[in-house]
């Protein structure tokens, strides 16, 4: 089974112990270790932030000690814009640019492929998108012609019943891509006024539409439908968890809100926790399990979080083995306890660890 | 090939603060990599007590915590250690390290012998 | 934090015999290094990554294990190998040494 590990290069700048650089990552932990996120600047891939080459180097030089281990760069995210991907795409003579600058800037800096993140094609970009992919295969089957191997295409995808139907022609995608990440979390956030787990494994007993495709369960099943093969679908697994702020003294799933949670001490974005700050926070919270979505959630006086445990990444592995998929993401390396100061095991990429362990279990 | 060299007082008296100095040459702790202190008490038993990152941050041992802490000298391509409170417990061989993989320890100081005594 | 427990804590091998150190761990570990130490010397790093010998290290040296077991093989024991060999792990947070292994030349 594949791990794919992305890794984030903001994390370099969380304060104290939740800085985190591409050195402290386990060499042997992932199959592919996927760096967040490169720029496109004049329709060329570049660097993002001021000591990207660094970094590139430093998470490369973990292939020196496994050899087995492959780096992929991704292009986009959030901060990038669907935009500035549309203009690059819809356009012939930019796309063309944007293409042939990535091997030989994958190559120069260490990396064995490429991960498109473009969050995401809007409806008119659909064929775009799938021209982006097709031509972009194209060109790294012929680069490798010289007996090079041959760099890996892959793409994270959303998760989400109206992205997916306005945003990708799955079958199509599917032939070009060696492997599809589909972010499976996010798919309960403060803009629903009420609790609800981001990342649930099944739909909850009360999801009524449009509620009942906001699960991982609906989106693998809704993408195999599609065309996608189980070979070369990833399932999403987060290390992170989203909350809450609570508006009265309900506490269950789908109780109301009144905002994002507080932020984190080291992420510093409401509504988000990294795992490691969820260690801390469960000190003296209340933990719940939401039986039929096999996902946890936990309170403390007006906070709720919903994430993501070693018991339930074991139940989406153990579900993704059952579908047959080719494997599993994590996002992010950054975000676990990647110390193993916070979660009181002491071990190193806890969460990790834990969809390792369950995709190599008989 | 990079070369580190402890330096500091062999004698402190207990409840003092220990200091120690790491050398670096041939290798910028500001290009990459972890600085580590480790000791090795006289009964030979090895304990790692931190480390100063490239990068500045650092991360410490828990059973020291409350009483370490490391800070550098770019600019003489050194990095320190400071251990308040000693004990004759804290009577050591001091080394500094460097790692390759961030989990092991590649090159190592000669070792300075520092005694807590009255 | 994880221990880890070496034994013999001191043998003896006669040249040309084969030699064989484990390490155990308290909890199961990703990889294991090995660090070799002389009297009056830092440590060296020996074998890294469980299995890998670092740059020096003769070939009559290996390493081996998984899970908590990892072992430290000399094929034929040569009295240069004579020393103090210590196991170390970081898989698990703070990092962590075996209180050693004491080979001597019969």
């Known amino acids: 089974y594949k791990l794919v590990c992305y890794y984030t290069s903001w994390s370099q700048y969380r304060e104290g112990d939740g800085s985190c650089f591409p050195d402290a990552l386990d060499r042997f932990l992932c199959t592919h270790i996927i760096y967040s996120f490169a720029n496109i600047s004049n329709d060329h891939i570049d660097t993002w932030e001021w000591n990207d080459v660094t970094l590139y180097g430093m998470l490369n030089t973990l292939k020196n000690r496994n050899p087995n281990l492959k780096t992929l760069l991704s292009v986009g995210g959030w901060n990038f814009g669907s935009q500035r991907f549309s203009k690059i795409a819809s356009n012939t003579q930019s796309r063309r640019t944007f293409i042939k600058s990535v091997p030989p800037f994958l190559r120069t800096h260490g990396f064995d492929g490429l991960d498109l993140a473009w969050l995401y094609p809007g409806r008119r970009d659909k064929q775009h998108f799938t021209t982006l992919i097709k031509e972009m295969k194209a060109e790294f089957i012929k680069e490798a012609q010289p007996g090079k191997k041959q760099l890996l295409l892959s793409a994270a995808l959303s998760a989400g019943k109206v992205t997916i139907d306005s945003s990708y022609d799955i079958a199509k995608i599917s032939q070009h891509l060696d492997f599809i990440s589909i972010m499976t979390y996010d798919f309960h956030g403060a803009w629903r006024g009420t609790t609800g787990h981001h990342s649930p494994l099944f739909r909850g007993q009360e999801d009524a539409s449009p509620d009942r495709f906001s699960n991982t369960d609906y989106a693998v099943g809704y993408m195999l439908r599609l065309g996608a093969p189980a070979s070369k679908l990833v399932m999403g697994i987060p290390t992170f968890g989203r909350s809450f702020t609570l508006a009265s003294s309900e506490t269950g799933v789908g109780a109301p809100i009144s905002g994002p949670g507080i932020p984190g001490r080291f992420t510093k974005e409401a509504g988000t926790l990294a795992y490691y700050e969820i260690c801390d926070f469960l000190r003296g919270a209340t933990v719940h399990r939401i039986l039929g979505q096999q996902v946890p959630y936990a309170t403390k006086g007006n906070q709720w979080v919903g994430y993501d445990d070693q018991e339930s990444v074991k139940s989406k592995v153990q579900y993704l083995k059952d579908r047959q998929l080719a494997g599993a993401m994590v996002w992010a390396l950054d975000l676990d306890d990647f110390q193993g100061s916070f979660c009181g095991q002491d071990l190193r990429f806890p969460l990790t660890n834990a969809i390792k362990d369950a995709l190599a279990a008989t | 090939d990079v070369q580190l060299q402890e330096s500091g007082p062999d004698l402190v008296k207990p409840s003092q603060s220990l200091s120690l100095t790491c050398t670096v040459t041939?290798?910028?702790?500001?290009?990459?990599?972890?600085w580590h202190w480790i000791r090795q008490f006289p009964g030979n038993k090895l304990e790692w007590m931190g480390y100063?990152?490239?990068?500045?941050?650092?991360n410490y041992n828990p059973s020291l915590k409350s009483r370490i802490s490391f800070t550098r000298d770019t600019s003489k391509n050194q990095f320190f250690l400071r251990l308040n409170s000693v004990t004759p417990e804290d009577t050591a061989t001091y080394y500094c390290?460097?790692?390759?993989?961030?989990?092991?320890?590649?090159?190592w100081g000669q070792g300075t012998l520092v005694t807590v005594s009255a | 934090q994880i221990v880890l427990t070496q034994s013999p804590a001191i043998m003896s091998a006669s040249p040309g015999e084969k030699v064989t150190m484990t390490c155990s761990a308290s909890?199961?570990?990703?990889?294991m290094h090995w660090y070799q130490q002389k009297s009056g010397t830092s440590p060296k790093r020996w074998i890294y990554?469980?299995?890998k010998l670092a740059s020096g290290v003769p070939a009559r040296f290996s390493g081996s294990g998984s899970g908590t077991s990892y072992s430290l093989t000399i094929s034929s024991m040569e009295a240069e190998d004579a020393a103090t060999y210590y196991c170390?792990?970081?898989?698990?947070?703070?990092?962590?040494f075996g209180s050693g292994t004491k080979l001597e030349i019969k």
């Open positions: 990554d469980t299995s």
């Open positions: 909890s199961s570990v990703s990889y």
């Open positions: 390290a460097r790692n390759y993989g961030y989990d092991e320890f590649a090159y």
């Open positions: 041939g290798y910028s702790i500001t290009s990459g990599y972890s």
């Open positions: 100063i990152h490239y990068s500045g941050r650092t």
């Open positions: 170390q792990q970081w898989s698990s947070n703070p990092p962590t």
